[in-house]
């Protein structure tokens, strides 16, 4: 019962986590304009992994996709890759874990097979969560570096009365969503791995068999042979994911009245 609960909870937590990773990856607020000196601004800038947006005080928002692939910073590309790998692994993990759930009966699937699948999905969730946390952390580090660089250069090029204030960017909501989601996926994965230990058959009991030989009557009683879980040996058909990662440049979305608080 506890195993089923642990497995089920692990699955639900991972599902929420992966949904969060997908949400974070799609969100536009990875970095937002720093409003420390000016809490009310007429033009507010924010950027995501796929496009950058400008919200005007008039309420209009204009977003532009990053039309280039090669012209983008390597760090941004790395973050994109980490998040996509995290989503792909998480999605496969979810698919595997559905079939591994103890509460779901699929034909005459043995407990050892379910244990293997639970462990596989658990590992996938752990790696998925780590990818998301790594991706978000890399982006956050990039922001911190750029923040202090732009702070140092903030009033450079000041000629007479004319000021050129550089726009500084700080952590956006997507970073926090990503960290939390990555953490949840990681926790879900650990729970699946824990559940897997309980799913593995602990003991194989053999029924007593009587052999009647001439002159002797010997009864062989059941012995306490430990069952071999053999996680590595009895993996049958490993699923191979053909990613075919498509990169789609977003078309410019025309300015639209955007609900904002």
């Amino acid at each position: 019962m506890a195993v089923t609960a642990c497995q089920g909870l692990g699955f639900v937590v991972s599902l929420i986590g992966i949904a969060g990773i997908i949400a974070a990856t799609c969100m536009d607020q990875w970095s937002t304009q720093d409003l420390y000196n000016n809490p009310v601004t007429a033009v507010f800038n924010y950027q995501g992994l796929w496009r950058s947006c400008v919200r005007e005080s008039s309420g209009f928002t204009e977003c532009r996709g990053y039309f280039t692939l090669l012209g983008l910073p390597a760090m941004l590309q790395a973050v994109r890759a980490l998040m996509i790998v995290g989503i792909v692994l998480g999605a496969i993990g979810l698919l595997v874990s559905i079939f591994a759930l103890k509460c779901i009966r699929i034909g005459s699937m043995e407990d050892s097979a379910k244990a293997n699948m639970t462990l596989t999905s658990g590992i996938m969730f752990i790696v998925s969560g780590l990818c998301a946390i790594a991706g978000v952390s890399v982006f956050a580090n990039m922001l911190v570096t750029n923040f202090w660089m732009s702070t140092a250069n903030m009033y450079t090029g000041m000629g007479g009365m004319v000021q050129t204030v550089q726009t500084r960017y700080t952590f956006g909501a997507a970073l926090f969503v990503g960290w939390v989601a990555g953490g949840l996926t990681l926790i879900g994965g650990v729970m699946m791995c824990i559940a897997c230990r309980g799913l593995a058959p602990e003991e194989t009991n053999y029924k007593a068999v009587s052999y009647h030989a001439s002159g002797h009557s010997v009864a062989y009683k059941p012995g306490g042979f430990k069952a071999s879980t053999g996680f590595g040996s009895n993996t049958k058909n490993k699923k191979i994911y053909d990613g075919g990662a498509r990169t789609e440049d977003e078309v410019q979305s025309y300015p639209s009245k955007h609900d904002y608080v």
């Epitope: 601004t41 007429a42 400008v54 005007e56 005080s57 008039s58 209009f60 009245k257």
Partner: antibody, heavy 118, light 113 residues
């Protein structure tokens, strides 16, 4: 057709308060911010502030904070500006204007002339 | 507050002539996020409210004749009327739309000989 119809001219005594209205038609009132602009005796223009009719959030020019209060009535698609503790300095033409792309003002009311005199 | 300085304060030209007026801001009006300059030009004819001519420094409002052209970036902006018509008699204002409070220039009065 878009229209911003402002209330008629006002003659007020110093120390009094006045409420100017701006009735809109022809567009979604809550979809666009409403700005208020002051023009003293044919001189330059001064931005007083704006209001987002959807969230009823306001942003004021520091100079007019405490002097002007911006409100809206969504049911009648009307924006209001109340000016209090009037002095002769407040004598001017007041315009309401709708926000557009680039924070520009694309449609303007015809203006309300306020005269403060004892 | 951003200070907007317009020059000249008044201008007298003959119909058909090309005219340029300048507007300078005390701070850059360029937004790196969308590569746009938040400067607007208005035309105010006597006894009328101002009329939007150009926003984002160079984008002409629909219905505005193409003889009106806005240019410039950062802190220096120009409004050009390629061939002045009698109906262009007005005061022209530039406005900072980049940061609060929105501020206007003192205006350039265009008179026709």
């Amino acid at each position: 057709e878009f229209q911003l119809q402002q209330s008629g001219p006002e003659l007020e005594k110093p120390g009094a308060s006045v409420k100017i209205s701006c009735k809109t038609s022809g567009y979604s009132f809550t979809g666009y911010n409403m700005n208020w602009v002051k023009q003293s005796n044919g001189q330059s223009l001064e931005w007083i502030g704006h209001i987002d009719p959807y969230y009823v959030t306001t942003t004021y020019n520091q100079k007019f904070r405490g002097k002007a209060t911006l409100t809206v009535d969504k049911s009648s698609s009307t924006a209001y500006m109340q000016l209090k503790s009037l002095t002769s300095e407040d004598s001017a033409v007041y315009y309401c204007a709708r926000s557009f792309y680039g924070n520009a003002f694309d449609y303007w009311g015809q203006g309300t002339t306020l005269t403060v005199s004892s | 507050d951003i200070v907007m300085t317009q020059s000249p304060s008044s201008l007298t030209v003959t119909a058909g002539e090309k005219v340029t007026m300048s507007c300078k801001s005390s701070q850059s009006l360029f937004n790196s996020g969308n590569q746009k300059n938040y400067l607007t030009w208005y035309q105010q004819k006597p006894g009328q409210p101002p009329k939007l001519l150009i926003y984002w420094a160079s984008t002409r409002e629909s219905g505005v004749p193409d003889r009106f052209t806005g240019s410039g970036s950062g802190t220096d902006f120009t409004l050009t009327i390629s061939s002045v018509q009698a109906e262009d008699l007005a005061v022209y204002y530039c406005q900072n739309d980049y940061s609060f409070p929105f501020t206007f220039g003192s205006g350039t009065k265009l008179e026709i000989k």
